[in-house]
Every structure is written in structure tokens, then in C-alpha cells.
């Protein structure tokens, strides 16, 4: 029975050349988190494993930093970084929870964070 919910930073925007923190939080469950995967439109960016810590995909090593916590920091943003990002929580005994974040990378200096929202 999956009772948990994932709260994410929702729809967010950031400036080109800057950095942004992607955050998800799993709540309302006592399930044990085995691993958290971060993906960008079907590409694996990074893994945070409960036993082994962080693994950053080689093709993203220069621009992705682990943390804070189970979150992920994207650096040196380009317009091509605009799109959907997913946090995938592998838990036991519940199973797999998925959260979605949409990032828009702006040319301008006006980049406001969107409201937080929940995905059951």
C-alpha cells in the first residue's frame, strides 16, 4: 500500500549561467528509501544510494553536484536545460514514487521560483 506523497519544488525558473537546486521530499510513509534517482527527460543524471552515497552520470559530472540532502544542484545552466526533471524514490516496502519538476532557464535576469505542489 503506497501511502506516501512527494513534495517537489514544482515549476521553477532560473537564469542562464546560474545554478538551481532541485528538491523532492517524500512524506506520509514509513517506507525505507533505498535509492533516489534524478532524471532529465529519460536521461539519468544522478543516483543517491542509501548504502553507497552519490553517483553522478559521467556526462553530467561537470555541471551536476550532489545535494543538499537528496536534492540535486544544476550548475552553469543553459537554455537547453529547460524541461522536465524527475526524482524517483525507490522505497521498501512501498515501491517506487515519482516527483516532477519543470525548469525554465531564462535569458533575462528576472527568474522567479514557482509555488510548491504535491504529487501523490
Amino acid at each position: 500500500m503506497m501511502t506516501g506523497t512527494i513534495e517537489t519544488t514544482g515549476n521553477i525558473s532560473a537564469e542562464k549561467g546560474g545554478s538551481i537546486i532541485l528538491q523532492c521530499h517524500l512524506s506520509s510513509t514509513t517506507a525505507q528509501v533505498t535509492q533516489v534517482n534524478w532524471e532529465q527527460q529519460d536521461q539519468l543524471l544522478a543516483i543517491c544510494n542509501a548504502d553507497l552515497g552519490w553517483h553522478i552520470s559521467p556526462s553530467f559530472k561537470d555541471r551536476v553536484a550532489p545535494g543538499p540532502g537528496l536534492g540535486l544542484t544544476l550548475q552553469s545552466l543553459t537554455v537547453n536545460d529547460t524541461g522536465e526533471y524527475f526524482c524517483i524514490y525507490h522505497t521498501y516496502p512501498d515501491g517506487t514514487y515519482t516527483g516532477r519538476i519543470f525548469l525554465e532557464v531564462l535569458e533575462s535576469s528576472v527568474a522567479e521560483h514557482g509555488a510548491r505542489f504535491q504529487i501523490p
Epitope: T34, I47, L52, D94
Partner: antibody
Framework: EVQLVESGGGLVQPGGSLRLSCAAS????????MSWVRQAPGKGLEWVST????????YYADSVKGRFTISRDNSKNTLYLQMNSLRAEDTAVYYC????????????WGQGTLVTVSS | DIQMTQSPSSLSASVGDRITITCRAS??????LTWYQQKPGKAPKLLIY???KSHTGVPSRFSGSGSGTDFTLTISSLQPEDFATYYC?????????FGQGTKLEIK
């Protein structure tokens, strides 16, 4: 080349014990989640147990919980399944399997070892 | 537990045919569906994971699709080495359950 080689299967009486081993090579064993999956003769596949890379976390199917224990020795690149209080319905080919780093699927499997529980 | 139901249970086809195997989950499993191929006396081999992602080295004639509860594995042009049993498996929640298998035989 990834290789997984199971051993330790055989004929055992109901109530008996057996320890299966799976020798791994060709990859960084300690970095990967591993599982045991079984297949009764002429039947489908059944997930049995999973262990995290460091061995801290272990998960079991209800049908084997309290009877089977999964473990690993990362210094020996070996996965184990200790099977106690064996029943006739545990008769199956037991496969060890390596998960993708992403934990999305089991990408390599051993050839299997047959466990027969019979009096 | 999530029940996985494959159809058909067996299928006769010829080399060059296009075939589709269906897997239905008893509840929503998002895209957490894997397809394996197994030949008699051999271990299963990974074909497709995350519903549609091909594993390294899998021929392009194999493709997967679907999300939620309904999934399909398609072989676009059957080759002699494709005759085997195919299993789907859900990775949404424990226990990770398999379908009963679809046996693909030569007509």
C-alpha cells in the same frame, strides 16, 4: 564481461537447509543491488529476495520471510542465500541477478542452480 | 500484490511476422514495466525496461510501449532466435511480480 555463477543447489529433505552462492565477476560487485529469483519446474518467475550494495538493506517475498536469509561478501564478490525450513514448494531453479545501477531492471542473470526439496 | 496478466499465453508465428504481446497490471504501475526473454534451460535476458527503454545490445526489432496498466512488447520481424518465452515484470511495488509468460512458438 559480466558473469554470475550459482552453486550450492541439490536435493534436500523437507525441513532441511541449504546455502546457495553466486560468484560475480566483470563488474564492481559492491556497487550493485543484487537479487535471487526462482522458477519452479515448468512455471514462471518469482522474485525471492534483494540486498543493497553494501548489504545494509535486505528485502524478502512473504513466501520465504523468516526462513531465507540473503547476504553478501563484497570482499569475495559473492552473494549468498541461506535457506532454512525448506518445503516442497521451494523446489525450483534459483537464479542470482544483478540490477542496473538505476535499479530499474535486472540486467544480468546467472545460469541458475536447482534446489529439490523431497523426502 | 500487483497481479500481472500476459496475453496470449502462447502464440504461433512465422519468421518475418510482426507480433505483439500484451501485459496488463492489476493497478497503475506508471512506466515501471520490464520485459525479459527466456529460452528453455537458460536464464532470462533483459530486453526492455521502464516500459520502452531497450537494454544495451537488444536488436531494434524489439520495442516496448505503454504506461499505467497496459503494456505491449512488439517484435517487428521475427527471427529464428526469437522463439522463446517472454515475461513482463512490474517494478512499481513489492513484491516485484512477473506475468505468467507468453510462449512464442514456430508455426
Amino acid at each position: 564481461e559480466v558473469q554470475l555463477v550459482e552453486s550450492g543447489g541439490g536435493l534436500v529433505q523437507p525441513g532441511g537447509s541449504l546455502r546457495l552462492s553466486c560468484a560475480a565477476s566483470g563488474f564492481t560487485f559492491s556497487s550493485y543491488i543484487m537479487s535471487w529469483v526462482r522458477q519452479a519446474p515448468g512455471k514462471g518467475l518469482e522474485w525471492v529476495s534483494t540486498i543493497s550494495g553494501g548489504g545494509t538493506n535486505t528485502y524478502y517475498a512473504d513466501s520465504v520471510k523468516g526462513r531465507f536469509t540473503i547476504s553478501r561478501d563484497n570482499s569475495k564478490n559473492t552473494l549468498y542465500l541461506q535457506m532454512n525450513s525448506l518445503r516442497a514448494e521451494d523446489t525450483a531453479v534459483y537464479y542470482c541477478a544483478k540490477w542496473l545501477l538505476s535499479y530499474y531492471a535486472m540486467d544480468y542473470w546467472g545460469q541458475g542452480t536447482l534446489v529439490t526439496v523431497s523426502s | 500484490d500487483i497481479q500481472m496478466t500476459q496475453s496470449p499465453s502462447s502464440l504461433s508465428a512465422s519468421v518475418g511476422d510482426r507480433i505483439t504481446i500484451t501485459c496488463r497490471a492489476s493497478q497503475n504501475i506508471n512506466v515501471w514495466l520490464t520485459w525479459y526473454q527466456q529460452k528453455p534451460g537458460k536464464a532470462p535476458k533483459l530486453l526492455i525496461y521502464k516500459a520502452s527503454k531497450s537494454h544495451t545490445g537488444v536488436p531494434s526489432r524489439f520495442s516496448g510501449s505503454g504506461s499505467g496498466t497496459d503494456f505491449t512488447l512488439t517484435i517487428s520481424s521475427l527471427q529464428p532466435e526469437d522463439f522463446a518465452t517472454y515475461y513482463c515484470q512490474q517494478g512499481q511495488s513489492y513484491p516485484y511480480t512477473f506475468g505468467q509468460g507468453t510462449k512464442l512458438e514456430i508455426k
